[in-house]
Structure formats: C-alpha cells, structure tokens
C-alpha cells in the first residue's frame, strides 16, 4: 500500500486543463526530495514529464507545471491544453528515481462530446448574463415563442411569449425581439447561476411546423488565479467584475468550506484580522478595484473571491473573481517587530526593511487609516515633506546598503498609536506594517533639555543642554537640526564622556549644543538623541525661537554665561557649515503608479511647510563645548 | 442548503453487487467534491471514494486501497447524484455508507472529514451469506 495518495482515475475533455493533487506523508525528508510526475511505457519504464528538479519534457513545454506545496504536504501537476494523446497511465511520486514512493493515475482525454448538429455552444461565467438567439421561419411569426430546459426526455417551460417564466428564473430571463427582425427572438439569461447549465431549447411554433434550435448553456466558476507570496510580503487582488456592476458595493471575501467570509467591502466592513493591514481601492468608473494586503501571515493562505453586490456580501448569481493564495515561509523578508511601545512625551525609533538591492530607492512611510475602504497618507519621504502636524517630530534617516531605514517620530502623544506602513518605490513585496502604542508616561523622560524655552537673541552665543540618563553612558549622543528633509547631525559636545563609567553621575550626565553667534535662519527644531552606529533609539525635541537683540540688553546670554563658568577654560569654538536646501521633492510618480491609496505627500508640498522650517539655513553655525 | 439522501443500500451475499446513490438537493455548484464513506460497528468512519468535477468536465476519482478495482464511483450529469458502484462484495465491507459534499473543488484532502460541508443520514450495507 503506497503512502502517497491522489485520484486514481482523471477524466477531462480535450482542449482542457487538469490539475492533479498527490498527497505526501508529512515529513521532513518528503517535503524537500525530489517531485515527479511520469509516464508509464509498455516496458515497464516510467519516463519523466516533470518534476521538482526543474526538469521539463518537451511534449509537456509551456504547457505544464509541477508546485510543491510543503505546508500542505502536497504537490500539484498542472497540465492545459490536454490532447487525446496524453490519455494513459502515469505516476506521481517522491523520491530521486521513478521507483521510489509513487501513485497511479489514470488519464483520459476525450473529444468534445457531440450535439446535435444545430447546437449553439454559450459559455458563461457565472453571475453574468447570455442572450440566446432563436431563428425562426416566416410562417411562425405570429405563433407562441418559448425556451425551455431539458430534463432528461422532457423540456420544462424557462419562458415563453405569453409571458410566464419559471419561478426559478424570476427576473432573470426575458423574451425579446430587436427593432423590426421577423426571424428571430432572442432570451436574456441573467445572473446566471451553475445550475443554469445545460441543454436548452428554442421553439416558434406548435407541432410538426415549429422551428426549433438547441443551445448548450455551460456556466463556468472561475478558475482562482494562483499567487505565490512571501511570509510577511505583500499582495494585490486586482479585480475587473466589469461595466454592469460599476455602482454596486464591492467586496473581497476569503473561502471557508461553503461560505465566503467578508475581509473588507466598500460598505465600511473589515475583518478585524486585516486592521491596519488591507486598503480597498477602486481604479476607475467601470468597477474595477484592487485590494492591497500587507504584512502576509501563514494563516492569510488560502481562497479569495471578490464580488459585487448592492448588500456588499456575496450573492449567487453575482460576477465573481477568485484567487488561491500561498504563502511561503521561506520568505526573504526579514521577520521585524509588529508591535512598538512608547509612552506620551517620549519616542520611538521604528526600523524599516527594505530589499538591499534597492538601496537607492525611494523610501517612504505612511499612516493606516481606518475611515472609508482604508487609506495610508504618507508622513514622510527621503524626498517628501513631511506632513502638517508632524513637523519638528518626524524623520526618516537612510541607512544606504544596510537593507533598512529608520522613522523616528518623538513628542508622542495617544493619537499617534495606530498603524504605519513602511514602504518603497521599488519591490512592492517589501511593506511592513507595524502597530505603534502609545500609553500615559508614568515617569520623567530619559532625555530632558534645559532650557526649555529656548529663546535664541540674534548674534549672541546660546548653549541648549540634553540630560541623559546612566544607562545611555556608552550610547553616542548626538544633537540634529530638523528639517523638512531630515534631521542633519550637528557638532555636539558630551560632558559626561570625561568620567570613568564606574563613577557615573546622574546629574551631571550632558550633551550641548552650541549656537555661535546665532543667526535668523538658526530658528526652528533641535533634536536630541542616542544611537548605537546605525541603530537610533530616544530622541527629545525643542524649539529654538531666534529674536533680534532689543536695545540696551547685555550681550550676553544667561544660558551660555552659567555654562561658561561652568567649564572654564574657554575652549575653542568648532565651526560647522550644516546645508539645508530648500526642499521641492515630489514622490517619484511610479511608486503608486497603480495604488492611489497611499497619499501623495508630494503633491502638498508647497503648502505643508512650517514657516519657521522653510528657507536655507546657509551658513548655520554649531560649537561644541 | 445542500441535502443529501443516499439510497441503495441493503443485504446481499459476498462476491455480489450493489448500487449507492446519493442525491443531492437546494444550492448545486458546478465544481465540487463528492465523497463516500463508511462506518462499520464499533469503528471509526473511514473514508471510501470521493469525485470532483469542475464547470469544464475533467473529473478526478479517488479510492481508498481496499476497495480499488472493485468499487467504481460516478457523477450522474442530468441529475445532482453520485453512484457508487460496489463489485466483489466482502464482509468487511459491511458498514453504514454516508455521503458528504463540499464546494471545495480539487482543492483539498477528498479523505479527511474536515473537507465536507453536508452529509447524508447514511444507509446500511449488510455483506452476509
């Protein structure tokens, strides 16, 4: 008795496809050998068609496929185009010989079966409608016209011209003639259902003189399209259900044994499952719309079928689009953390991935949005603006060829937990979803600045100081200018560098800053943080506000004056010219070419930039002291 | 919904044959599995034979070891039903016979229970002399 198990026997007709499932006893040696399906000859040898070498036979070129699934213990021979001459005996099997473990199938191909000879052959998928054209003779012009279905010897009444239809095609079927055509009626079918399938008959007239004409009715489930996907990629369901149901409620729903589970409809309904993790997004007027997956979970494999309907549920005898998804657990994605924590007043730091090839990408990251099918408005961009309401708290910093980029956003309060999307405009698998939290600080932040109401005056010195904490005492400190384009590392200095880490004080552990002499354009936001190389942690922001110098007041700025008693000698003061050009970044139009969804921040611009973070900070100065 | 009423079932003599039918009723789909399985005294239901199709007309017929070359499974097209025919009866083959169907297509295991949505109340094969 052979362990592998699949359909013994395979039926189909020629010009079809099949697709043959062989079962594998789940373990870890037959998910990884060797897959193949042969062909059984009169001597006993069984010759390769396919298999999970990579092995393709001519007579099965471009015609056949051979996709291990491991999950499942499965793997599946597809083969289209079917001839009679494939019809025989093959086995499907494991193992590095065709002798090893295997299964018998059989395969028979047949012709097209044969109708009568007047047979028109309708194909139709379902939920769609066919119009079936019925010929008659001059002499039955004024007789009763009808359609029927055959039920074995009998054909039972679908419609006729004195108006009765059957009860189970109620408001689906009409009878009708075009303009002044005295030879033929047609029957309109709609909404068509599987069990619509089949042989019917037209008729014009009663007895021996009446014309009649057979129609073949097949009414097709789709075919799921297969998507492979990565662990923790991302996928797109596009679908075209077509004109005739462009203002009808649209909906994806994932296949549960008979019912069709709603994931998210235009009618606001989202399976809690997807949250922060899924946008609807219709394309154009004629019903097309795609549906984007991000963050792919083992669990998300499975069926998909998107439809339309007024309800925005499923419904028979409504188009449908059906797809099977895989997802592979060998993904190159690397596995990153789902879920950041941060407490009001404080930071975090959230590390993107992103393919290395692309290092030269554009990266991008955005906000989740519930409302309406879901949105993603981007925040910040390596060339967009950042967005209204996160000036001053949001950068992006690349870290070129490390195959991630990190978002840091500081001053958080409760609104900002919910669900961000790091993304790029190069390989669209690479989006990672990530669940930010906020709770209520219950303590003092790590990172304090004094003063804190910084107030700059016009050509005087002025030293803003950054606390931190013991246990940042090995961390590299840094203090960076915000701007509309990042955050651009000044020269700092560490105070609390000079002790030995044994004797670390907690009062007297200081990063400053200096500005020397101040200049207008040295307004505007000034981040304090630690990072380890290129890993950032806690960062904390001021506002630094600049002011001409009023008459009569002393040149001298109090801050700067204590810090100066503080650390005489008087030291040097190190020059540095930190650039900022004037940000006119637009996002690059192919990076949502085809997902309107994600907003571009691009297009608001010119009008998202903050007054006191517009301008070129030329000749910004900083001394470290 | 979908219901399903076997019939068919009875006494005969070992080496005899019989035919199962199993009908089904309400919602129909144009591609789905149809599977038998029986259940003798005091055992575990085990799986027998199963057929998918799909709205193309390819076929796929499955069989449990004990019972390939004896027992033939097939679609009736005009109808909802599913035969089974039963050759070579033996006495092991006495069990209550259930019929299932699922609209999952060739997608699944047809042996495991778990892939049928409807079931029949089952009919009673008795293979004694």
């Known amino acids: 008795q052979s362990p592998i198990f699949g359909p013994q026997d395979v039926s189909s007709i020629e010009g079809n496809s099949v697709s043959i499932t062989c079962y594998y006893p789940d373990t870890s040696v037959n998910r990884h050998t060797r897959k193949y399906w042969c062909r059984q000859g009169a001597n006993g040898y069984c010759a390769t068609l396919i298999s999970s070498n990579g092995y393709l036979s001519k007579e099965y070129s471009g015609r056949a496929s051979l996709i291990n699934f491991p999950e499942n213990s499965t793997f599946v021979i597809n083969i289209a185009h079917l001839t009679q001459e494939d019809t025989g005996s093959y086995k499907c099997g494991l193992g590095t010989t065709n002798r090893g473990l295997f299964f018998d199938v059989s395969l028979e191909v047949s012709q097209v079966p044969e109708f009568p000879n007047d047979t028109h052959v309708y194909t139709k998928d379902i939920g769609r409608t066919v119009t079936i054209e019925c010929r008659f003779k001059e002499g039955n012009a004024h007789s009763k016209k009808s359609l029927c279905k055959k039920r074995g010897e009998a054909c039972e009444v679908v419609i006729d011209s004195t108006e009765y239809v059957d009860p189970s095609y109620k408001d689906r079927a009409i009878l009708f003639m075009k303009g002044t055509s005295r030879d033929i009626f047609y029957v309109n079918i709609s909404h068509l259902i599987p069990s619509d399938a089949g042989l019917y008959v037209c008729q014009a007239g009663e007895g021996p003189s009446a014309d009649k004409n057979n129609a073949d009715l097949q009414v097709l489930e789709p075919e799921p399209e297969l998507l492979y996907k990565d662990l923790r990629s991302s996928v797109t369901f596009e679908c075209d259900l077509g004109r005739e149901v462009a203002n009808d409620a649209k909906y994806l729903c994932r296949k549960n044994k008979e019912t069709c589970d709603v994931i998210i409809n235009t009618l606001g309904k989202r399976d809690p499952a997807f949250e922060g993790r899924i946008l609807l997004t219709p394309r154009d007027d004629n019903g097309r719309f795609s549906v984007l997956i991000t963050g792919l979970r083992k669990e998300d494999a499975g069926h998909y079928q998107c439809g339309a309907h007024s309800s925005g549920l499923p419904q028979e005898g409504w188009p449908v689009q059906a797809w099977q998804l895989f997802v592979n657990e060998e993904s190159t994605i690397p596995n990153s953390r789902s879920v950041v924590k941060g407490v009001t007043g404080g930071s975090v730091a959230i590390v993107c991935p992103y393919n290395p090839k692309e290092s030269s990408s554009l990266k991008y990251w955005c906000h989740w949005e519930a409302d309406e099918n879901g949105r993603c408005p981007v925040l910040v961009g390596t060339q967009a603006l950042v967005q209204e309401g996160y000036e001053g708290r949001l950068a992006l910093f690349d870290q070129p060829g490390s195959g991630a980029y990190t978002v840091i956003l500081n001053q958080l309060t409760t609104q900002d937990s919910g669900f961000y999307w790091c993304l790029t405009d190069g390989d669209s698998r690479w989006r990672t979803t990530i669940e930010l939290q906020v709770a209520e600080a219950t303590k003092k932040p790590d990172l304090e600045v004094t003063p804190q109401n910084a107030t700059a005056v016009i050509g005087e010195t002025f030293t803003i100081s950054c606390h931190y904490p013991c246990k940042f005492y090995s961390q590299e400190k840094y203090w960076c200018k915000w701007s509309n384009d990042g955050c651009h590392i000044l020269p700092s200095h560490d105070e609390g560098a000079r002790q030995s880490s044994v004797s670390c004080d907690q009062s007297s552990q200081i990063v400053s800053m200096t500005l020397n002499p101040v200049k207008k354009e040295d307004e505007g936001w000034y981040w304090c943080g630690v990072k380890e190389g290129q890993v950032y942690g806690e960062t904390t922001a001021i506002y630094v506000a600049v002011e001409e110098r009023t008459r009569g007041s002393p040149h001298i700025n109090p801050t700067d004056a204590n810090a100066r008693a503080k650390d005489a000698p008087e030291e040097e003061a190190m020059e540095s010219s930190v650039r900022e050009d004037e940000n006119k970044a637009n996002l690059d139009p192919r990076l949502f070419a085809d997902e309107r969804e994600i907003q571009n921040a691009g297009d608001q611009a010119q009008e998202n930039r903050a007054s006191g973070n517009a301008g070129s900070a030329g000749g910004q100065s900083g001394s470290s002291k | 919904e979908v219901q399903l009423v076997e019939s068919g079932g009875g006494l005969v003599q070992p080496g005899g044959s019989l035919r199962l039918s199993c009908a089904a009723s309400g919602r129909t789909f144009s591609s789905y599995t149809m599977g038998w399985f029986r259940q003798a005294p005091g055992e575990e239901r085990e799986f027998v034979s199963a057929?998918?199709?799909?709205?193309?007309?390819?076929?796929?017929?499955y069989y449990t070891d004990t019972v390939k070359g004896r027992f033939t499974i097939s679609r009736d097209n005009a109808e909802t039903t599913v035969h089974l025919q039963m050759n070579s009866l033996k006495p092991e083959d006495t069990a209550v016979y259930y019929c299932a169907a699922s609209s999952s297509g060739t997608y699944g295991d047809p042996r495991s229970e778990r892939e049928y949505r409807y079931w029949g109340q089952g009919t009673l094969v008795t293979v004694s002399s």
């Open positions: 057929i998918s199709w799909s709205s193309d007309g390819t076929y796929y017929k």
